[in-house]
Amino acid sequence: SEVEVVPFQEVWGRSYCRALERLVDVVSEYPSEVEHMFSPSCVSLLRCTGCCGDENLHCVPVETANVTMQLLKIRSGDRPSYVELTFSQHVRCECRPLRE
Amino acid sequence: SEVEVVPFQEVWGRSYCRALERLVDVVSEYPSEVEHMFSPSCVSLLRCTGCCGDENLHCVPVETANVTMQLLKIRSGDRPSYVELTFSQHVRCECRPLRE
């Protein structure tokens, strides 16, 4: 049977260094808030990821932007309330030498 | 100032357990091929990720499908050649109890 094979150029294009949605734990971005719980406990952020086709290069952000999100903060013994938290997103990515 | 704040329901929807593109090292899926190099060295696969709104639940695949991709295999001292590699993708995800 003729299985649909993703051609090389498409595989390459989708694997190459770019900003991709990643789910990041809120407390990893706000370690000072570790004693509180947030809902959701993770947020979707754009992060540079992918391969560069050269072991001496890695995928890094060359432009970032802030995004502010509304989350529920769960304070012990109190009703949850909305808070605004600001996160850094990766806007533009490039393959740069590892030694930089 | 009326800064664009991502509202809670949208934050929740984007963070909740779902299949999301992730860049995965080829050799992590094909450890027996560790002595060879592939180009690209990583591939974009759908993987279940996200949070479940409950510490007793985690995001798991409940349906998977195979995808076959064309990559370049670099054999030492030989010209690279195309190979077809099959990977497992996550199609449908659900929040399930951790103990399962």
Partner: antibody, heavy 116, light 112 residues
Framework: QIQLQQSGPELVKPGASVKISCKAS????????INWVKLKPGQGLEWIGW????????KYNEKFKGKATLTIDTSSSTAYMQLSSLTSEDTAVYFC?????????WGQGTTLTVSS | DIVLSQSPSSLAVSAGEKVTMRCKSS????????????LAWYQQKPGQSPKLLIY???TRESGVPDRFTGSGSGTDFTLTISSVQAEDLAVYYC????????FGSGTKLEIK
């Protein structure tokens, strides 16, 4: 204890502007949203907008864009709402309210009367 | 915009009677992942500011008498007062916070 103390009643002429204040005490002002709500005589409650004192970010009900302007002074833990180009339709009681998504602490209300 | 329809607009009952009022939303207020509906009930007594009674559709606010019960999910919600007291004379509003905030038009409770 947590309190929201609003400024006193206002009698203003059509076309004028008014600024209502809401002084918060008993909690960390920058941690909670302040919302403003309108209660018109014989009618129900209407949400005007919110301000997040931690950032100064605001969000308005479309109906009140251009009518209401929300500001804060974090040094005095006070929220303000300015209403402009007043008409008789703006005659109402205005409440400041702490928190979202559920409104837990309300000010005592400020009565605004627009009359020539 | 989400529209909340409250019924009845007013009712009069004797002390000790059971009262039920309803709130219907034009769209679901349920966050299915959280398994919570973004609906609250408020009580406004004459000459006073509104007071939070119920949130998440069924969670009683601290200090609220247990004769007040909220129920429902999605689009249909109910506030029940199991045995009305004279001090329950008030207007009761439902409010959604799924998308921004809107209030129902209120149910005025009178005591015979």
């Amino acid at each position: 204890q947590i309190q929201l103390q609003q400024s006193g009643p206002e009698l203003v002429k059509p076309g004028a502007s008014v600024k209502i204040s809401c002084k918060a005490s008993g909690y960390t002002f920058t941690d909670y949203y302040i919302n403003w709500v309108k209660l018109k005589p014989g009618q129900g409650l209407e949400w005007i907008g919110w301000i997040y004192p931690g950032s100064g970010n605001t969000k308005y009900n479309e109906k009140f864009k251009g009518k209401a302007t929300l500001t804060i002074d974090t040094s005095s833990s006070t929220a303000y709402m300015q209403l402009s180009s007043l008409t008789s339709e703006d005659t109402a009681v205005y409440f400041c309210v702490r928190d979202s998504p559920f409104f837990d602490y309300w000010g005592q209300g400020t009565t605004l009367t627009v009359s020539s | 915009d989400i529209v909340l329809s409250q019924s009845p607009s007013s009712l009069a009952v004797s002390a000790g009677e059971k009262v039920t009022m309803r709130c219907k939303s034009s769209q679901s207020l349920l966050n299915s992942g959280m398994r919570k509906s973004f609906l609250a009930w408020y009580q406004q007594k004459p000459g006073q500011s509104p007071k939070l009674l119920i949130y998440w559709a069924s969670t009683r606010e601290s200090g609220v008498p247990d004769r007040f019960t909220g129920s429902g999910s999605g689009t249909d919600f109910t506030l029940t007062i199991s045995s009305v007291q004279a001090e329950d004379l008030a207007v009761y509003y439902c409010k959604q916070s799924y998308h921004l905030f809107t209030f129902g038009s209120g149910t005025k409770l009178e005591i015979k």
